[in-house]
Amino acid sequence: QVPPQYPPIQSIRVQFTRCENEKGCIITSPSKDETMKVQDNSIIINCDGFYLISLKGYFSEELSLSLYYRKGRGPLFSLSKVTSVDSIGVAYLAFKDKVYFNVTTHSTSYKDIQVNGGELILIHQNPGGFCAY
Amino acid sequence: QVPPQYPPIQSIRVQFTRCENEKGCIITSPSKDETMKVQDNSIIINCDGFYLISLKGYFSEELSLSLYYRKGRGPLFSLSKVTSVDSIGVAYLAFKDKVYFNVTTHSTSYKDIQVNGGELILIHQNPGGFCAY
Amino acid sequence: QVPPQYPPIQSIRVQFTRCENEKGCIITSPSKDETMKVQDNSIIINCDGFYLISLKGYFSEELSLSLYYRKGRGPLFSLSKVTSVDSIGVAYLAFKDKVYFNVTTHSTSYKDIQVNGGELILIHQNPGGFCAY
């Protein structure tokens, strides 16, 4: 008998090379094989459960950056006046959540912020739980 | 043929709003659906394997905090003279281990320490390994 | 009907007690039950996907340490002039990758660096993906 295979785990890696002041970072998914989707510059959460979240990037100027998942809730990450980020977190997310950036720069100009190595990874940790597509 | 489903992953999120000096933090599990249990203020480990561990909290005063899993073993986390914690770790835990806090404040009084956002998450990383219930 | 079991997750914990200047750290796997293998002082990657990586250690002298996975690619971790490390990361690795150390000390002597609590853990996060053995 063939041993059971794992159904694919919900996970995604998005890249970002540019962030807009007072807005967010422009995210793109380099792979077509991702099991999660990007929509309106947000990562769509379909499955309830814990997620492992990795955020990396080097910014062209000092900024404050937050990663949100739901209106009215505190951010997943919040970094104040940084030029780089390399953080890992765990959070419980649920169907209908959307993961997105908010960025503020401290310069008077409203130029875009350039990003090197900008990468956001989400990996679902509770396969077998509730999902809605 | 229906694709195999994942059996539930062993995971738990406990909250704590209060820590007692020279003792630990009073942990409660907000969800009844957790696949791991709290007993005598400890999280009970039933399954051998690696665990992803996330610890967060904002404390009303400076304290030193350790997270233990087995008598005679070093702590999973150890933080000295902090007013907040936001740490992630990986550790190998085994059946019969119990994850619990130890806290010391540096004030002369023996006050309870209040906690906002106190959260401890454990997620098993090796489903398919040995478990005993 | 018996519910499907999880096939073993690809994971490994290696220990290292000694690092050689201008070379790497001598890694050994304390358990025979690991689902990943060590070969030529490297951890062999057989399965594509995200990996949770934990690196810990206390060094007998100041050193610079990098953890690589593929020729011509940047390191998974890079620490400059440290006497200890306690880091967690997430990275996408693929079949044929090999995870290995590179170490440089800043002393004129070329003595080995002694390590306490030297531990490197890799845990595959995408079971169900491509593997080749």
């Epitope: 505190g74 951010p75 997943l76 919040s78 | 709003t17 005063e61 004030s107 009084s109 006050k111 | -």
Partner: antibody, heavy 119, light 106 residues
Framework: EVQLVESGGDLVKPEGSLRLSCVVS????????MSWVRQAPGKGLQWVAY????????SYTDVVKGRFTISRDNAKTTLYLQMNTLRIEDTAVYYC????????????WGHGTSLFVSS | SYVLTQLPSKNVTLKQPAHITCGGD??????VHWYQQKLGQAPVLIIY???SRPTGIPERFSGANSGNTATLTISGALAEDEADYYC?????????FGGGTHLTVL
């Protein structure tokens, strides 16, 4: 000199919305937890909401949960209180307060901004 | 939720000691803070962590806390001490204020 200056108070109809702001100076805003406290006319102090220094942890008094949202912009050294579905009993002077690391006492307060909810 | 009980008002003769109490279940296990609020002004922290005085607060103000009662003492009340006094604690991620005591200096 530590200063906290609230603004945004107004006359609002029931079920309406309003956002209060508190601009701070004189201390490292991004290092301190903050709170909003209110005082209804002729009444005592009532704690409303808490936010951690990095904005990742929040808590609320029961009567405003689900209606009010506390947030902060550390870049702008500003604390906010978004108030939705306002009720007549939300009428009060709203103070922002800095929390110390000694038992979360509120060691500095603003002068307050007034909210009137009336039809 | 946790409840703090204060007497609504208290009179004290000029230059005499005043004791303002704050009752709560096992309040001695919690850190109590005291605030003074004069008419039309914002509150001011006068005692934190049961008995510590912030810089600039006169020595006549002191605090104690044990059992089910915390006490704010003004060793010799002055006319300028006429105000509302509030105790405050944290409990289960929430802050709680007492109802306040109005001190009148006669």
């Amino acid at each position: 000199e530590v200063q906290l200056v609230e603004s945004g108070g107004d006359l609002v109809k029931p079920e309406g919305s309003l956002r209060l702001s508190c601009v701070v100076s004189g201390f490292t805003f991004s290092s301190y937890d903050m709170s909003w406290v209110r005082q209804a006319p002729g009444k005592g102090l009532q704690w409303v909401a808490y936010i951690s220094f990095d904005g990742r942890s929040t808590s609320y008094t029961d009567v405003v949960k689900g209606r009010f949202t506390i947030s902060r912009d550390n870049a702008k050294t500003t604390l906010y209180l978004q108030m939705n579905t306002l009720r007549i009993e939300d009428t009060a002077v709203y103070y922002c307060a800095k929390l110390s690391s000694s038992g979360w006492s509120m060691d500095y307060w603003g002068h307050g901004t007034s909210l009137f909810v009336s039809s | 939720s946790y409840v703090l009980t204060q007497l609504p008002s208290k009179n004290v003769t000029l230059k005499q000691p005043a004791h303002i109490t704050c009752g709560g279940d096992n309040i001695g296990s919690k850190s109590v803070h005291w605030y003074q609020q004069k008419l039309g002004q914002a509150p001011v922290l006068i005692i934190y962590y049961d008995s510590s005085r912030p810089t600039g607060i006169p020595e006549r103000f002191s605090g104690a806390n044990s059992g089910n009662t915390a006490t704010l003492t003004i060793s010799g009340a002055l006319a300028e001490d006429e105000a509302d006094y509030y105790c405050q604690v944290w409990d289960s991620s929430a802050s709680v204020f007492g109802g306040g005591t109005h001190l009148t200096v006669l």
